[in-house]
Amino acid sequence: RKAVLDCEAMKTNEFPSPCLDSKTKVVMKGQNVSMFCSHKNKSLQITYSLFRRKTHLGTQDGKGEPAIFNLSITEAHESGPYKCKAQVTSCSKYSRDFSFTIVDPVTSPVLNIMVIQTETDRHITLHCLSVNGSLPINYTFFENHVAISPAISKYDREPAEFNLTKKNPGEEEEYRCEAKNRLPNYATYSHPVTMPSTGGDSCPFCLK
């Protein structure tokens, strides 16, 4: 391998296309993201440029380490596509396109409870709905902070429903639900709803 001024002396396999990636692929508007442009050849003095469509967003150089471009996704059109150009003197190669998926975060869901009380049992129906947020939304129901349902996926703006039957409890139970969509590490919870213990008219949700 010679230290040469003319990059055209390089073989194609010595200078393949760069790779453009981000740890975060699903984002919400206003989110800050980091994009990484890297190259397999760790010996070359590479100049990396980032583009969104035809707009030049920035340039960095690096050898043996990726270029890191920090961006803020504020508008829908900023989802992409992004391209990274790696240049060594007069040689340049482009990465594949990379696009973010912009997802509206879920708002705190509302939990509604309906109970049919019999002498021995309570038949409980839990409804959970988040009125805002990109679909699909996964709902999970909790009793006393323990998940009691699998994730229920809703592809429409209809409440998730979960039924359970319980022996009339002697202690009050607390229910809440979680709403989550494709935004990683972003889940919202309903206000807790407390079911009182049996006795008297202490079941405000009950249909008798």
């Epitope: 230290a3 040469v4 001024l5 390089m10 003095q45 100049t47 150089d61 050898k63 380490e65 003197t89």
Partner: antibody, heavy 117, light 111 residues
Amino acid sequence: EVQLVESGGGLVQPGGSLRLSCAASGFSLNNYFMIWVRQAPGKCLEWIGIITSYHTTYFANWAKGRFTISRDNSKNTVYLQMNSLRAEDTAVYYCAPYDIYGYPTLWGQGTLVTVSS
Amino acid sequence: DIQMTQSPSSLSASVGDRVTITCQASQSIGAYLSWYQQKPGKAPKLLIYEASTLASGVPSRFSGSGSGTDFTLTISSLQPEDFATYYCLGAYGRSSDDGTAFGQGTKVEIK
């Protein structure tokens, strides 16, 4: 023939300014990172700074504020502007492009700058 | 900021001797180090780059080793044309202010 020629050196008074040129022939400087290096008489090589292919410049701490590097791609030339010159800036000044691996391989013959009253 | 400390500053040797020059970086620079030979009144000449890769046209008696902070240039059998001053040049992987520096040089003289 591929070569670099530095020019613009000479005698200058303390406090004066000088602009050195580094012209390339036989190849285009446009896409190359260019560094400036100097060597005082009988002393070691000293890195001054670099201009990237995308026109960003970086300097040794001692050169910041007094020295600037620019490039004119249409003239295939890189410049070193030196202001507020001092006696200790007396040296031979070299330019060199980085090769594809990021090392200066091709050097000019240098241009001598003498700062004296 | 990067500083390169080269040693020894000078050495006397005879033709045929094995000569070793060391260079230490103030911070880790991976393998981003090159070695240069300079003769009086001449521009530097690249010998080694990437710490251990021999530059084009350089005799194989020259070799380089090291990574991180400690680097070595070795001349296995000193020849008459090798009497010169040798410099290391260290750099970070990304261009930055004060991100490149030469060592102080090692003058190899005839004993």
